[in-house]
Interface confidence: low
Amino acid sequence: FKVATPYSLYVCPEGQNVTLTCRLLGPVDKGHDVTFYKTWYRSSRGEVQTCSERRPIRNLTFQDLHLHHGGHQAANTSHDLAQRHGLESASDHHGNFSITMRNLTLLDSGLYCCLVVEIRHHHSEHRVHGAMELQVQTGKDAPSNCVVYPSSSQDSENITAA
């Protein structure tokens, strides 16, 4: 399977909400012994390998934001911890999974990574990630709503195998 990032750049005004999205592509094994661990974290540019750093999103680390379920099942994060930080990660039946960030501030600007780990018999078998950038703007030049920029076809399937 692969992870696609429909948009590589999100430009949003301060105070707005944004939903960053990744999509699971390709054949997904629905066997009883196969589950998927999906999560989000921040990273930094200028690395040899994109998404190699695992930084918290608003003090929530990648395991705080994770979803753990079978194939294309729907799921979302526990509401208490994440929602206190204005965050919610979710997954639908179609392979889409996302993180919603509420009331954006300039500090939210940066590189965000989605991570999917396929787990068989409790062992990590395959891992892929996708990356996208969020720019939060303020002042007269800021857009009134979030503007999204589609990924190039090359970028939209950002694959990193274990």
């Epitope: 661990y37 190699s52 003090n59 680390t61 990648f62 395991q63």
Partner: antibody, heavy 123, light 107 residues
């Protein structure tokens, strides 16, 4: 109670491969956020981070040694391994394994260390 | 790589003194900085994490401060058991790097 213990050959000749084992208890490397690093310290000198392995088998290496390092794990037996190929006298050091937890609000530090295993590379 | 520079490399102080050790990062490491104490013949022991948080069981005379590129470890009312080498370590980015160490001795 969290404990880690390193095991190594003690003495190697130049060009041989070093195989180290870190056996741990008190935590599971299958748990989200857990990770184990290898760190070394030549006698009387400072600490040098070598490699890290995450719970999900993601791995990180020190670029200065990356071509010679391989880190791996066996979560079911609570062990982490490190191989260093083509050792030289400069690899003479005490090798530590240490737990690094990426946890809520206070991640990215080594909270538990093994006692260390000493390697001497000599012809 | 982020280079961590500690100063001084060694210092001598009297019992009861307040001792300050500094650590400078070549790049911004936010607050992802830890301090470790290594007594002669022993393993490193975590003292401070996230720049200023005292690890469980560490005496309150140890404190840490700073963010970005400049950090300080302070030991107030120096005790005989504080004789050790102290290391800072950044966790901002790989490769993880340590300072060269500060060897603390009693006058």
């Amino acid at each position: 109670q969290v404990t880690l213990k390193e095991c190594g050959p003690g003495i190697l000749q130049p060009s041989q491969t070093l195989s180290l084992t870190c056996s741990f208890s008190g935590f599971s490397l299958s748990t989200s956020g857990m990770g184990v690093s290898w760190i070394r310290q030549p006698s009387g000198k400072g600490l040098e981070w070598l490699a890290h392995i995450y719970w999900d088998d993601d791995k990180r290496y020190n670029p200065s040694l990356k071509s010679r390092l391989t880190i791996s794990k066996d979560s079911s037996s609570n062990q982490v391994f490190l191989k260093i190929t083509s050792v030289d006298t400069a690899d003479t050091a005490t090798y530590y394994c240490a737990r690094r937890l990426d946890g809520y609000n206070d991640p990215y530090y080594f909270d538990y260390w093994g006692q260390g295993t000493t390697l001497t590379v000599s012809s | 790589d982020i280079v961590m520079t500690q100063s001084p490399s060694s210092l001598s102080a009297s019992l009861g003194d307040t001792v300050t050790i500094t650590c400078h990062a070549s790049q911004n490491v936010n607050v992802w900085l830890s301090w470790y104490q290594q007594k002669p013949g022993n393993i490193p022991k975590l003292l401070i994490y996230k720049a200023s948080n005292l690890h469980a069981g560490v005496p309150s005379r140890f404190s840490g401060s700073g963010s970005g590129t400049g950090f300080t470890l302070t030991i107030s009312s120096l005790q005989p058991e504080d004789i050790a080498t102290y290391y800072c370590q950044q966790g901002q980015s790989y490769p993880l790097t340590f300072g060269g160490g500060t060897k603390l001795e009693i006058k």
